[in-house]
């Protein structure tokens, strides 16, 4: 055949020969020769190799330290890390998920967009005209002001981002 | 063009003692590993034996292991088989055979030396 | 070691013909380390594949070969006058590297 410029696919050059990498999951004992083929062996327990490799050590599983809030959501195998996520009310700080912190409140004036998840913290919205947000909450939208019409009242205390629409009785007209 | 040129068959007794070598041209030897591959009149081809391209590793089949004895000179571009203890089943053309690039396949041949073992 | 089992022994076809041969291992060959050699009549074998499906150097495109673990095939899609002769895999995943014992292609 053609001298090759570069081995085939799941292939590594070592030696003048091209030698099979280990599957998932193993980790290689020894490089192929002119006359044996690659030696792997599979990973141990809590260990993993997620690719075709050549590599002589697998890597350790993802431990979820409980102590910073974490839990696992996926048990590694021994192809995949472990995957950890947050306790409830707590979310990742980090795409790798290293460590967690509480989710954060929206404050007064603010709302709700959208809650948080194990992975993204709280995403927060000024209270548009017309509604208002009078507690600090991880979970509140905001709520529209009261309409007094409909209760045959009238506002007697214009309503803030803060505060809700105060509504008093209709002044009578005396005939 | 690679060549290579098997030498030093014959009639031999059953007992005895043979040398066979293998001439090598059209190639740089020393970067291929090399082999030794026989084949019965009328039957199958069997895997003798085979060598590194340095000499370091050398690998047998059971059927001539302890008997047979493959080496290597590089400076000669030679590659040779000494055969003790000669049995009549050893009887065979022998094949030597280089490497093809980078794989564990045998892609040249030399035409063959017979040995005959017999009394 | 590893055994090699061919079949058929002997598989009987015109030229135009599709030819399948079949090569089984007692035990997984690792990584697809597998050849297929042709040997004719007086000569030496000739190399056709390599590591089970790559074709050697100046093999025509009609030879073919597949498979993985313990079940390999070599396959000649249309026989040429010149395709008749004896097959056999080798296998070199680990010394002792074995052979299996033949499949004759005949002309019917």
């Known amino acids: 055949p053609e001298p090759p410029t570069a081995c085939r696919e799941k292939q590594y050059l070592i030696n003048s020969q091209c030698c099979s990498l280990c599957q998932p999951g193993q980790k290689l004992v020894s490089d192929c020769t002119e006359f044996t083929e690659t030696e792997c062996l599979p990973c141990g327990e809590s260990e993993f190799l997620d690719t075709w490799n050549r590599e002589t050590h697998c890597h350790q599983h993802k431990y979820c330290d409980p102590n910073l809030g974490l839990r696992v959501q996926q048990k590694g195998t021994s192809e995949t890390d472990t995957i950890c996520t947050c306790e409830e009310g707590w979310h990742c700080t980090s795409e790798a998920c290293e460590s967690c912190v509480l989710h954060r409140s929206c404050s007064p004036g603010f709302g709700v967009k959208q809650i948080a998840t194990g992975v993204s913290d709280t995403i927060c919205e000024p209270c548009p005209v017309g509604f208002f947000s009078n507690v600090s909450s991880a979970f509140e939208k905001c709520h529209p002001w009261t309409s007094c019409e409909t209760k045959d009242l009238v506002v007697q205390q214009a309503g803030t981002n803060k505060t809700d629409v105060v509504c008093g009785p209709q002044d009578r007209l005396r005939a | 063009e690679v060549q290579l040129l098997e030498s030093g068959g014959g009639l031999v007794q059953p007992g005895g003692s043979l040398r066979l070598s293998c001439a090598a041209s059209g190639f740089t030897f020393s970067d291929y590993a090399m082999n030794w591959v026989r084949q019965a009149p009328g039957k199958g081809l069997e895997w003798v034996s085979g060598i590194k391209s340095g000499g370091s590793s050398k690998y047998y089949a059971d059927s001539v292991k302890g008997r047979f004895t493959i080496s290597r000179d590089n400076s000669k571009n030679t590659l040779y088989l000494q055969m003790n203890s000669l049995r009549a089943e050893d009887t065979a053309v022998y094949y030597c055979a280089k490497h093809v690039d980078f794989y564990r396949a045998l892609d040249y041949w030399g035409q063959g030396t017979l040995v005959t073992v017999s009394s | 070691e590893i055994v090699l089992t061919q079949s058929p022994g002997t598989l009987s076809l015109s030229p135009g013909e599709r030819a399948t041969l079949s090569c089984r291992a007692s035990?997984?060959?690792?990584?697809?380390?597998l050849a297929w050699y042709q040997q004719k009549p007086g000569q030496a074998p000739r190399l056709l594949i390599y590591?089970?499906?790559s074709r050697a150097t100046g093999i025509p495109d009609r030879f073919s070969g597949s498979g993985s673990g313990t079940d390999f095939t070599l396959t000649i899609s249309r026989l040429e006058p010149e395709d008749f002769a004896v097959y056999y895999c080798q296998q070199s995943s680990a010394p002792p590297w074995t052979f299996g014992q033949g499949t004759k292609v005949e002309i019917k």
């Open positions: 035990q997984s060959v690792k990584n697809s380390s």
């Open positions: 590591t089970a499906s």
